[in-house]
Every structure is written in C-alpha cells, then in structure tokens.
Amino acid sequence: TVPPMVNVTRSEASEGNITVTCRASGFYPWNITLSWRQDGVSLSHDTQQWGDVLPDGNGTYQTWVATRICQGEEQRFTCYMEHSGNHSTHPVPS
C-alpha cells in the first residue's frame, strides 16, 4: 500500500466565488474516497466534480475533486481522504 499525497488549491471562479480543488496522487491501490465537507458534513454529490482515478505512470494513481464556494467561507470546508483504512482531512489554504 502506498498512501496518497493530498494537495488543496484554490482559484478564482467568478465574483465572490472560488473553486477549491483537492488532488490525491501517488497512491496504490486505486480505491480511494475523496470528497469535500462543509461544516464536517459531506457535500451533496451534485455540488462536487470528480476526476477519474488515473494511473500516473509510476504504478500508482491520481484523482481530484473540486467544488465552488463563497470567498470568505474557506474555513468551513475541508477535503476528506480515505485510503486503505487511513484517513485525513485537509483545509483550504488561505
């Protein structure tokens, strides 16, 4: 088992909104849970966009999940990762 590296980034989306993206890479096996949580509760599926789980060329895998949030509310959102029985949460950088 190889645990993922998780990286959270933000980018301007539109006035007052930002897109936050959580990327997991370098993990094996490919089964992973990656999702955004608002106030600790998973966001509805229809408010998140997921990338496919793809091989990254090193025998490991990568994927991502993104959502759009209001600027100034970043502290309420965390990216939750679960892989091979291990889990972690990752905040949005300020």
């Epitope: 608002q38 106030d39 966001l43 509805s44």
Partner: antibody
Amino acid sequence: DVQLVESGGGLVQPGGSRKLSCAASGFTFSTFGIHWVRQAPEKGLEWVAYISYDSRTIYYADTVKGRFTISRDNPKNTLFLQMTSLRSEDTAMYYCARWAYEGGVNYFDNWGQGTTLTVSS
Amino acid sequence: QIVLTQSPAIMSASLGERVTMTCTATSGVSSSYLHWYQQKPGSSPKLWIYSSSNLASGVPARFSGSGSGTSYSLTIGSMEAEDAATYYCHQFHRSPLTFGTGTKVEIK
C-alpha cells in the same frame, strides 16, 4: 441568548400531512446548519434531516426520505419540516438542533424544547 | 447507512464503580466524526465527548472515550450520582447521519 422554538405539532391521522417550524433567535441563523432530530416516547434519539446554512446540502434519514422535506427561510430566521404520508411510527417529539462549527469540530450545541407530533386515527 | 449499536442497553452501577459502554458501527467511522451525547429525562442532549476521545467543556475528567474504526467506547472511571443518564454515540462520517441505540446508566 440562543433560542430555538419548535411549533406545529399536534394530532394527525395516518396518511396526513403536517408542517413543523423552528423559529431561531439570538444568533445569526443564516450562518448555521440546522438538523431535525426526533425522539419517540420512551425511545432513543433518531436523526431526521439536515440542511446546511446555505441550503446547498440537504440529507434525510432513510425512514423519512421521500416523505419529509426540510427547508429554511434565512431572512425570517425559520426552519421548516414538511411531513407527508405520515405513519404511526412518526409519532415523536421533534427537536431542531443547531450544528455548531468551532475549532474544526462540528456538533449539536443548542436544541429547542421540542414539539410533539402524534399520528393516530 | 451506518448503524450504531450500543451495549449494554441498560446498566446499573454502584457509586465509585468503573463503567464502560460500547458503540459498534456496521462500517468504519473516522474518530473525528464520532461524538457522544448525554441526555437526562426531560432535557435536551448535551455534547459529552467529541471526536471519540475529547471531553466537551465542563465534562468531569472521570469520563474518557476511545476507539477507532467500528468500535468505540465511553468509560466513567468512578461512577457518581450525577452521571445517571442515557448516553448516545453519533456519527456524521457518512450520510445519513445516525445516532446509536443508547445506553441508560442507572444507580444501583
């Protein structure tokens, strides 16, 4: 002081409908997620539904999905629970509860006094 | 959905006795998303232990919580009269959120 006051309970016939309300005061309602939790007589707590502060995320317990609808009116500081196709097993005290966020921890920090719904013919 | 089963359902303890109750989940729950609430008759529940092992504000140090995965426990190191209540575990790891079946602690 934070206050949550439920209303709308009463006696309803099986198959009937009812709308519960939860009036909030003493805090900025529009910045908190709120849940409905119920407790049947002499039974345990049962989570019913959740609505995030911006209504973006809504979840229901399997037992009420398709029958109950949670909503909120932020300008009026009010939470609602529209209940349809009511069954005897929906008889319970219904509480609204605030979902706090503090230091990265989320939990129920304030509860209303509850409103009693009885479903019976 | 994740079902939380608490055991025992009811227990009697003497003052000064050590009390342990368990909360078993049908699938794994992150310790961050597992809380315990205390409820006394006629009152609303109160947060008692959060994130599996952290005592909420005002909770006596005789209480402790532990566990991971599918098995969690709450322990009262030395039972006192004011501890008589029903304790519920609660998870929000996955939706729908769920409460445990509850453990009622009585004074023997």
